[in-house]
Amino acid sequence: QNLFTKDVTVIEGEVATISCQVNKSDDSVIQLLNPNRQTIYFRDFRPLKDSRFQLLNFSSSELKVSLTNVSISDEGRYFCQLYTDPPQESYTTITVLVPPRNLMIDIQKDTAVEGEEIEVNCTAMASKPATTIRWFKGNTELKGKSEVEEWSDMYTVTSQLMLKVHKEDDGVPVICQVEHPAVTGNLQTQRYLEVQYKPQVHIQMTYPLQGLTREGDALELTCEAIGKPQPVMVTWVRVDDEMPQHAVLSGPNLFINNLNKTDNGTYRCEASNIVGKAHSDYMLYVYDPPTTIPPPTTTTTTTTTTTTTILTIITDSRAGEEGSIRAVDH
């Protein structure tokens, strides 16, 4: 056997090169046939009416042909024939790769609520071979479940991702990424998660700055409530008591002028949205006015809790009368 060919892999729409090589030539006729065994080239002549085939080289040792705009129907065995004694035949297989036609991502719900499990589907249509789909939430890879549907040598892959969403996922992209031999670089599509969550409430003491509340001083507390959708209602209440007469409420701010010991107690900021409600408590303790010897400075105590679990407690740096919990978030 002195007739040689090489298999060809080509992407749909691109150019395939078919080469029939002869080692020891005796000027015999060489011809190239398609998978239907129709003659494409007979020596340097193309009897076949398909003008996508063009002669690249013809000599006693080689017949080299290009096939432009390759389609899936061109796939198969192409035969080189040499009219020697005995006649020789060798075949080359053209494999056509088809990248996915389009990539569609579909989220079950446009807006999800924290804690909810949502279904995200990604479909890569009509590729050959079947596409591999990978999922990412931001930079984190997730595991999906793929189903492959075959139709006429083409594959449609649908991957399903079940995703439990958290508030931190709001605005994070869910990425469907395709891996396929006909695709170079990154072929991906993404959708941004929209996650609704109940408010997170945080109280900040904006006055006095040093954080120590004494008789006769003023107190200003600001309630920060962040949620999705943004809370419409932010209200201040005094737990187990009436709000002091001299307290002034202005949106998220609470002002109490001329503090006295009767103002001691727990002040609660409540916020709500369509997902739910939350609150944060501030425990006010009014200290005696300063004596002639100034007392040591103290730090503000802030406690953040979720469902009454205290996550952080910052207390006064020295033990004693002023070491108390000041704010608790719920």
Epitope: S28, T39, F45, R46, P47, T84, P87
Partner: antibody, heavy 116, light 107 residues
């Protein structure tokens, strides 16, 4: 230049055989198939078959299977076509033609007359 | 079917254009070849492939193809173009098949 020279006219009786020769020159004889085509008086061209001069392999038209034999002698670059069990309707001009997908060169033709 | 059909005869005035057609299934796949045969002579290849002329064939001969029909056109027919014209292609087995032939008369 390429030339195909055929043997002279033949008159044969029905049932006999005829062997027509075709001598090639001006090209590599083994490099091209040789075909045989015949034409009855006032009729069109009729393909009979081919021989691969390199291997001696043949392919005959269904109509002539069992009656035609194509051979070659590469030492003298000559192809032969023998038709046996001749009938009166085998009266025709017999041509050899070089196959370059199309027939780019033809012999001058050999008239074979079959008559009692 | 492995038959190629041609009109039996056509006539053309000297210097005018004549078109000969050849029809057959194999012509969907392959280009036809065209041969000119004058009385008492062997056929001569005049057109092959998409529209190729062997050397020595005048450029008034041209070929074209569409679907299952091949055509030979003689533009500005001359007296010496009076002859029989045969188309030729290959069947599904790769064997040659000739057309029925067209007699061209130049008036």
């Amino acid at each position: 230049q390429v030339q195909l020279v055929q043997s002279g006219a033949e008159v044969k009786k029905p049932g006999a055989s005829v062997k027509v020769s075709c001598k090639a020159s001006g090209y590599t004889f083994t490099g091209y198939y040789m075909h045989w085509v015949r034409q009855a008086p006032g009729q069109g061209l009729e393909w009979m078959g081919w021989i691969n001069p390199n291997s001696g392999g043949t392919n005959y038209a269904q109509k002539f299977q069992g009656r035609v034999t194509m051979t070659r002698d590469t030492s003298i670059s000559t192809a032969y076509m023998e038709l046996s069990r001749l009938r009166s309707d085998d009266t025709a001009v017999y041509y050899c033609a070089r196959d370059n997908w199309n027939y780019d060169y033809w012999g001058q033709g050999t008239l074979v007359t079959v008559s009692r | 079917s492995s038959e190629l059909t041609q009109d039996p005869a056509v006539s053309v005035a000297l210097g005018q254009t004549v078109r000969i057609t050849c029809q057959g299934d194999s012509l969907r796949t392959y280009y036809a070849s065209w041969y000119q045969q004058k009385p008492g002579q062997a056929p001569v290849l005049v057109i092959y492939g998409k529209n190729n002329r062997p050397s020595g064939i005048p450029d008034r001969f041209s070929g074209s193809s569409s679907g299952s029909t091949a055509s030979l056109t003689i533009t500005g027919a001359q007296a010496e173009d009076e002859a029989d014209y045969y188309c030729d292609s290959r069947d599904s087995s790769g064997n040659h098949v000739f057309g029925t032939g067209t007699k061209v008369t130049v008036l």
